[in-house]
Structure formats: C-alpha cells, structure tokens
Interface confidence: low
C-alpha cells in the first residue's frame, strides 16, 4: 500500500513545487520525496521497508501521476542511503537519500529546494506547506494530482504531552497541528516547507491521521545537516 496521504488539503497548483518527488515502487507511488540536489532526493527511511524485491524509481516534474506532462521524468536509483541509525520500530532518524542514476534535467518544473542548515526550531504557529500524493480521505481515495495543505507548527512541549506523543518528540523532530488537516502515514518522505525552505520531512511511523491530539511528526533536516552533507559530498 502507498505510504502517504494529505487530509483536508486541496489540489496544488501544477508544477509550483518543482522540488516535489514521487518515490515509486514497481511503477506505483509509494512515498513523497524532495529534490535537494541535482542528483539527490531526500525521503524517509521507512519507505524502503516495503520495497525489498521491487524496483524503486523517482518521478520528478510531475503534477499528475498518470497523465503525460512534458516535464515528467522517471529516474532509476543508483544508490539508496538510509540514515545509519534508522530502525524499523522507531521514528527517529527516519531519513533516506536516493542518488538518481543521473543528474536531473532541471527546469521550471524540476528544481532542488534549499534546505535548512541552521539547527534552530521553527517558531510555533509558523504556517508550513506539506504536499503529497497520498490518500485524501479515510475511505482511502488516492489522488492522481499533487495535493497540499498549510499547517501551523506546534511547540514541542505540547506535542510531547502524555495525551499527545508522550515524550517521543526529540530535539531532532518537530510537530505540526493535525486538526482535520494533516499529513499522514506517508506523504512519508515528503517535504514540510516553511518560508520557502525545507525544514522537515514527513516521518513514516504509523499514527492516526487528522486527530488534533496526534500531531504530525516531521524529521528536522537541520539536525541532520552533517549527515546529508557527508552523503552528498
């Protein structure tokens, strides 16, 4: 099953997020991803748990998953680099770098997104954009076109309340509100963009979606700058 959904959002403006990637397994959308360099896509490590015997590829330049679009191109994956500390049973270090088989052909619809290097929390209440091709309702309808939603950042103390995530949100994670509007168990690997900069990657741990007491959890990319740089070097 695809790991991902945007709940309570709307269709994105076509090709307005040229960094957006669809990580695909055997030709079907599996996870979101974000182009961070000409030959590298950042996603979530857990996305590959379902991919043991399949062909993983990355779709760039897409709005519709099914319709022909001039900017769309599917790239093979030369190298998959999960964060060395990621583990199946935890949301910590849930990052994955995918090296494309060649440098992406850049253009208006395909462009890397600058990512945050300053390791400082995004201010609570900041509106951030999350996008993906995951299911759009609890009945499981999958969208063909990219969806997005704006979500306010939630402070870590609230997110760590016993009634919420009960202390699981480390300094390397951040939360966003989830009251009916939410990312969910996918869109996993997709970008959380604040002020035009990549701040977070949607984690792929399973949790209930759209419930305000279970905020969305995002891996803070700034906390992993050294690792990202070392892989991209």
């Amino acid at each position: 099953p695809p790991r991902g959904r945007i709940l309570g959002g709307r269709e994105a403006e076509a090709h307005a997020r040229p960094y957006m990637a669809s990580v695909q397994l055997n030709g079907a959308h599996l996870c979101g991803g974000v182009l961070v360099a000409e030959q590298w896509v950042l996603s979530a490590a857990h996305c590959l748990e379902d991919a043991a015997d399949g062909k993983v590829q990355v779709l760039l330049g897409a709005h519709s998953l099914s319709q022909p679009e001039p900017s769309k191109r599917l790239y093979d994956v030369l190298r998959a680099v999960p964060h060395p500390d990621s583990q199946p049973d935890t949301i910590d270090h849930d990052l994955l770098l995918l090296q494309l088989s060649e440098k992406a052909t850049l253009g208006p619809a395909v462009r890397p997104l600058p990512w945050q290097r300053v390791d400082r929390d995004v201010a609570p209440g900041t509106l951030c954009d999350v996008a993906g091709w995951g299911i759009v309702n609890h009945a499981g309808r999958r969208p063909d076109s990219l969806q997005h939603v704006l979500l306010p950042v939630l402070d870590r103390a609230t997110c760590n309340r016993r009634t919420h995530h009960d202390g699981a949100i480390t300094e390397r994670l951040m939360c966003a509100e989830s009251n009916r509007r939410d990312s969910c168990k996918g869109d996993s690997g997709g970008p959380l963009v604040c002020g035009g900069v990549l701040e977070g990657v949607v984690t792929s741990g399973s949790r209930v979606c759209g419930n305000r007491k279970k905020p969305g959890i995002y891996t803070r990319v700034a906390s992993y700058a050294a690792w990202i740089d070392s892989v991209l070097a």
Partner: antibody, heavy 120, light 107 residues
Framework: EVKLVESGGGLVQPGGSLKLSCATS????????MAWVRQAPGKGPEWVAF????????YYVDIVMGRFTISRENAKNTLYLEMSSLRSEDTAMYYC?????????????WGQGTSVTVSS | DIQMNQSPSSLSASLGDTITITCHAS??????LSWYQQKPGNIPELLIY???NLHTGVPSRFSGNRSGTSFTLTISSLQPEDIGTYFC?????????FGAGTKLEIK
Amino acid sequence: EVKLVESGGGLVQPGGSLKLSCATSGFTFSDYGMAWVRQAPGKGPEWVAFISNLAYSFYYVDIVMGRFTISRENAKNTLYLEMSSLRSEDTAMYYCARVGLYGNFFMDYWGQGTSVTVSS
Amino acid sequence: DIQMNQSPSSLSASLGDTITITCHASQNINVWLSWYQQKPGNIPELLIYKASNLHTGVPSRFSGNRSGTSFTLTISSLQPEDIGTYFCQQGQSYPLTFGAGTKLEIK
C-alpha cells in the same frame, strides 16, 4: 583493503550456462553499486551489467539482455552474474568491479577476473 | 549509445617526457569521464574519475582535463612503470562505453 575475488568461470559449450560469483571484503558492500565488465583477448574492456546497492536498479548492455542476470546478496557481500544461452563472442575475462560513489558511473576497484571460454 | 573515440591508438615516448592522450565523446557527457591504466598482463585500474579527480594513491604526474566533449589524460615526467594501455570510459548514460585504448611504450 578493498578486495574483490571472482569465481565460477570455465569452459562451456555454446548455448550453455554459467554462474559467476564475486566475493567482496574491505568495504561496506551494501553501500555500493556493482558491475561486471568483460575483456576479450587483445581487446578493450566492455561493460556488461550494473546493479545498484540495494538492488533497486539493473542495467545491461544490449547484447546480453535477456541472457545474463546480475544479482547480489548483501548479507554475504557477494555479487553474481548468471549467464545462459552463451555464445562464442561471450568468451572473455570477466571482472567484478565496484562502482564509485562520487557521481555517475565509474569502476574504482576491480577483481582479478575469472575466465569464460565458450567453445565446442 | 555514446561513442568514445580515443587517440592515438599507440605512442612511444622517452622517460621524462610529457604525453597526452585524447578521448572525444560523440555527445555531451558533462564531466562523467574516467581514465584507466592496464599494465601488461594485469587488470584495469582507475586513475582519474569525473574528468580531473585523481583516484586514491595515483601519482600526481597524472592529470585529466575537459574541454567540451573532448577529454585529455596527461602524464608528465614519464616513468618506466607507466607502460601499458590506457582506456577512457564515459559514465553519463547506459550502456557505459570505453574508448578503444592507447598503448604506451617507452622508447
């Protein structure tokens, strides 16, 4: 020290099959794409096949497509090349090579090779 | 497929000389060009990757350069151990292709 050791070559009749193995050590095998390259006597190298580090991508040169299969067992640090419907023009020294990490494709370490002769 | 035209096919030079081998790609391959050395009876070994980057342990008398779709390998101050055949290889796209080789001999 990076070490690549091929085995499994030999004399085979046209139409026959062979399975080559490449045992590796000295590096984290699952981080690297791997390739098979062959070299016929007196000729230059010819790239044959590539497999990505977690086996999500495969490439073959056209002439072996459908006859050769590249695979890997990361738990055993081993690369394989299964060859069937062999032809006389497949006669060559077959090298296993590690694919470098610094961008597009090149082979940074090579094994000593295993000889394949296809003849009746 | 991308063709790699390598020249000369052979050359003879004296110890201490500087020699240049050229590889021309049939289409744009960016910087994705590698050079290998194969000593007689031995395996190919990587010298240079990404057009101009020296592989670990390769002496600094070897250097690589790119000009558009033409690439050069230069060996300065030729040493006896430099004899062998040199191959270029493009890594831009599959199938990966090699040049036909340049056999270097010492006068």
